[in-house]
């Protein structure tokens, strides 16, 4: 029967008693930094050429046995998880394996940035079709090893990386921290973390997603028809690398921010024990468990947007944190939160030609962090439009006034330590969706963007009772672009993007009391784009 | 129910080429190896080799390379072992059996074709 | 290539008594990553194919009767016949499938006394 894994990451329509993806990923060459490998086992023979780079340390400890199945073991194993011709995700696609880890495991920063660059080369001299590159390991963080990264992704090429396996917070680590490459926690036959002997899977804002990584059947180097289970975020790594594969087998023009924004949408959501990471760790985590797409083409027509969360901003009076989108993504929407409840809110602005989502700290505050909504919206055109804090008693407002522009998101952002403890709620007027409005001691930005077809509205969600969390989420068919708290709801810690849904959060509610102080309503801002779905629907 | 019918008794000279067949039902043919094993007349059995219908890939056991083709058509679920130019000592029956890769144990046996090979 | 060789090349057993079979493997086939014995005992009666008894060494195929047994491990295995049944008559093979090429023993046949 299927094992666990690849029952895990198929949908339900392609369920069976075996495992048949529809497309195997034949379009694609996958790269494996890895140790070396047993190239004539059954199970990956003829799909991975075993190039000639070797750039390893020498082994540790001066009785060092080296044994080849053993030298062989990760690097085998997670060749036939990618593409294994039994218990591979993508059984189509090819590899090619370059030597980074020694027979203990242990690699370089220079053998990676070696390995990298010899990819680079080859990509140079030879140019093939879409190129994934897997990366299954993790080390101290390294600047050096995140930028070598940066430009390989920049240059077209697709990167996922294992998380690591240390409990600990993955941007710690490289090259999980690097932004541009897609990294991958390891999830088991529970949907829960991965616990490792004393260890586990690493977790937090670095993460992208999780996928099956623990008790995972793949080659064995032991022999050439042997299966062994081996369990780690490699071997999550190396799920999402298949399923990369196949995506790109289906839709080889996809860009790597194409690539990730789909992996997230067809994940499963909101499955994962979050009890497990650390409690400053959980917000930040994606909930996220890889999974193929029902059908490898025609998800062209929807908007996809992924929240981004900055690193914290320290809790300095004048600290801010800032949130970027990739390259290819639109920011349209910013929001902060802060565990103190202490912030002066967060606003949308240009840094080298592009828009930043920035939260500020505010005194006695532990720190902030910047969340981005992240879009992918082709032919947009965004701007921010500011109002300055107001004087009149209704509060600041402001809206889209170009034709043709939409709002997106509301940010609000202020000078004063205590806005909002002892004010009134300002209500919206009703009829103006196209309208963010704040206090009138803050500044409001609107993200207003016009691109083809693009419709939006605001939903909103009001408890009068005070509640720690309130929600408001988009209907299908609608992607959330904007998450924010009403102004006059006091004790807010902020608002976030999960998956299609505005998360407001608010101060424990033993410490506050019942009036009307404790309102808390949250506003979403859903959008959808006509423009996509009827292109989507001419292709087919 | 799981089977392989392989195709019928051949009676050919020596210096005739002869293709017999396998063909798999009941499970997903692509998805097993289909191994190929001999056994002359009062002998034991002999591995010949596989192949992974799914991409074709086959591995033969060296005492066989170059003496027989293994392939398969999996549009149909058929494998198929084929000679170029018999001789009289290639006189045997011939087995088709399943595999799959984490149990690399023949769990499915074909009925076997009778190849006698006679001037 | 392994060598396989099993041990005795015919036996005839009063019907009710125990048959042991031996296979000897020229080098181990015991993997220690997934502790596992790639070792299979197969059933042959006259003019029919092969049946699959026993795999990893002593796990039983689904539908053959508990009087087969497999045991052994590394390089000594044993198929017993705990009660031998007349439709036990037949020549039962062992075959390693840890490495190419796959090889199986000589054959023991079984026979009633």
């Known amino acids: 029967s299927i094992p666990w894994n690849l029952e895990r990451i198929t949908p339900p329509r392609y369920r069976a008693d075996e495992y048949q993806p529809p497309d195997g990923g034949s379009l694609v060459e996958v790269y494996l930094l890895d140790t070396s490998i047993q190239s004539d086992h059954r199970e990956i023979e003829g799909r991975v050429m075993v190039t000639d780079f070797e750039n390893v340390p020498e082994e540790d400890g001066t009785r060092f046995h080296r044994q080849a199945s053993k030298c062989d073991s990760h690097g085998t194993h997670l060749a036939g998880v990618v593409s294994g011709r039994d218990a591979g995700v993508a059984k189509g696609a090819s590899m090619r394996s370059l030597r980074v880890l020694n027979c203990q495991g242990k690699g370089t920063v220079s053998g990676t940035l070696i390995g990298l660059e010899f990819i680079r080369k080859s990509q140079l001299v030879q140019p093939v079709g879409p190129l994934v590159v897997l990366l299954p390991l993790a080390g101290g963080y390294s600047r050096v090893l995140n930028a070598a990264c940066q430009r390989l992704a920049r240059a077209g090429v697709v990167l996922v990386t294992a998380a690591g396996n240390f409990r600990d917070d993955a941007c710690l680590y490289s090259p999980a921290s690097a932004p541009e490459v897609i990294t991958v926690g390891a999830t088991n036959a529970q949907d829960q973390p991965v616990t490792l002997g004393t260890l586990g899977t690493n977790f937090g804002r670095c993460v992208d997603l999780f996928a099956p990584g623990e008790d995972i059947i793949g080659a064995s180097s032991d022999c050439s028809t042997c299966f062994v289970s081996q369990s780690g975020t490699s071997q999550a790594a190396a799920h999402v690398a298949g399923i990369a594969a196949m995506m790109l087998s289906a839709e080889p023009e996809l860009t790597l921010a194409e690539l990730r924004q789909r992996l997230i949408h067809f994940s499963a959501k909101d499955v994962i024990n979050e009890a497990w990471f650390p409690e400053d760790q959980r917000v930040l985590t994606p909930n996220l468990v890889a999974a193929l797409p029902p059908s490898t083409h025609g998800a062209g027509w929807q908007l996809f947007c992924r929240t981004v969360w900055s690193a914290h901003s320290g809790p300095t009076r004048m600290a801010t944190a800032v949130a970027r989108c990739a390259p290819d993504e639109e920011l349209l929407s910013c929001s902060s939160f802060s565990r103190s409840g202490k912030r002066r809110g967060e606003r949308m602005e240009a840094q080298g030609g592009k828009l930043v989502c920035r939260a500020h700290n505010a005194f006695g505050g532990e720190g902030v962090y910047a969340i981005a909504r992240c879009c992918l919206l082709p032919q947009a055109n965004c701007s921010v439009h500011t109002a300055p804090p107001a004087e009149a008693s209704m509060g600041t407002r402001v809206h889209c006034h170009q034709q043709g522009h939409v709002l997106t998101g509301c940010s609000s952002h202020w000078e004063v330590e205590d806005l909002g403890t002892h004010k009134p709620p300002v209500l919206r007027p009703r009829g103006q969706p196209n309208q963010c409005v704040g206090h009138r001691e803050a500044s409001i930005h609107a993200s207003c963007c016009h691109a083809p077809g693009l419709e939006c509205k605001v939903k909103e969600h009001g408890i009068p009772a005070p509640q720690e969390q309130v929600t408001v989420a988009c209907e299908e068919g609608w992607t959330l672009t904007g998450c924010s708290a009403l102004p006059g709801t006091s004790h807010v810690l902020g608002a976030y993007a999960v998956d299609n849904t505005c998360v407001v959060r608010s101060r424990d509610v033993s410490t506050t009391g019942s009036t009307s102080e404790g309102a808390v309503t949250a506003v979403a801002i859903c959008c959808r784009s006509r423009h996509l779905a009827q292109a989507s629907q001419e292709l087919q | 129910q799981v089977k392989l019918v392989q195709s019928g008794a051949e009676v050919k000279k020596p210096g005739e080429s002869l293709k017999i067949s396998c063909k798999g039902s009941?499970?997903?043919?692509?998805?097993?190896?289909i191994a190929w094993v001999r056994q002359m007349p009062g002998k034991g059995l002999e591995w010949m080799g596989i192949?992974?219908?799914?991409?074709?890939?086959?591995h033969y056991n060296p005492k066989f390379q170059g003496q027989v083709t293994i392939s398969a058509d999996k549009s149909i679920s058929t494998a198929y072992l084929q000679w170029s130019s018999l001789k009289a000592s290639d006189t045997a029956m011939y087995y088709c059996?399943?595999?799959?890769?984490?149990?690399?144990?023949?769990?499915?046996w074909g009925q076997g074709t009778l190849v006698t090979v006679s001037s | 290539d392994i060598v396989m060789t099993q041990s005795p090349d015919s036996l005839a057993v009063s019907l009710g008594e125990r048959a042991t079979i031996n296979c000897r493997s020229s080098?181990?086939?015991?993997?220690?990553?997934?502790?596992?014995?790639?070792l299979a005992w197969y059933q042959q009666k006259p003019g029919q194919p092969p049946k699959l008894l026993i795999y990893?060494?002593?796990t039983r195929e689904s539908g053959v009767p508990d009087r087969f047994s497999g045991s052994g491990s590394g390089t000594d295995f044993t198929l017993t016949i705990s009660s031998l049944q007349a439709e036990d008559v037949a020549v039962y093979y062992c075959?390693?499938?840890?490495?190419?090429?796959?090889?199986f023993g000589q054959g023991t046949k079984v026979e009633i006394k």
């Open positions: 059996a399943r595999d799959h890769g984490y149990k690399p144990f023949s769990d499915i």
């Open positions: 009941g499970y997903s043919f692509t998805n097993y190896y």
């Open positions: 192949i992974y219908p799914g991409d074709s890939y086959t």
């Open positions: 080098q181990s086939v015991l993997y220690s990553s997934n502790n596992k014995n790639y």
């Open positions: 990893w060494a002593s």
């Open positions: 075959q390693q499938y840890s490495s190419f090429p796959i090889t």
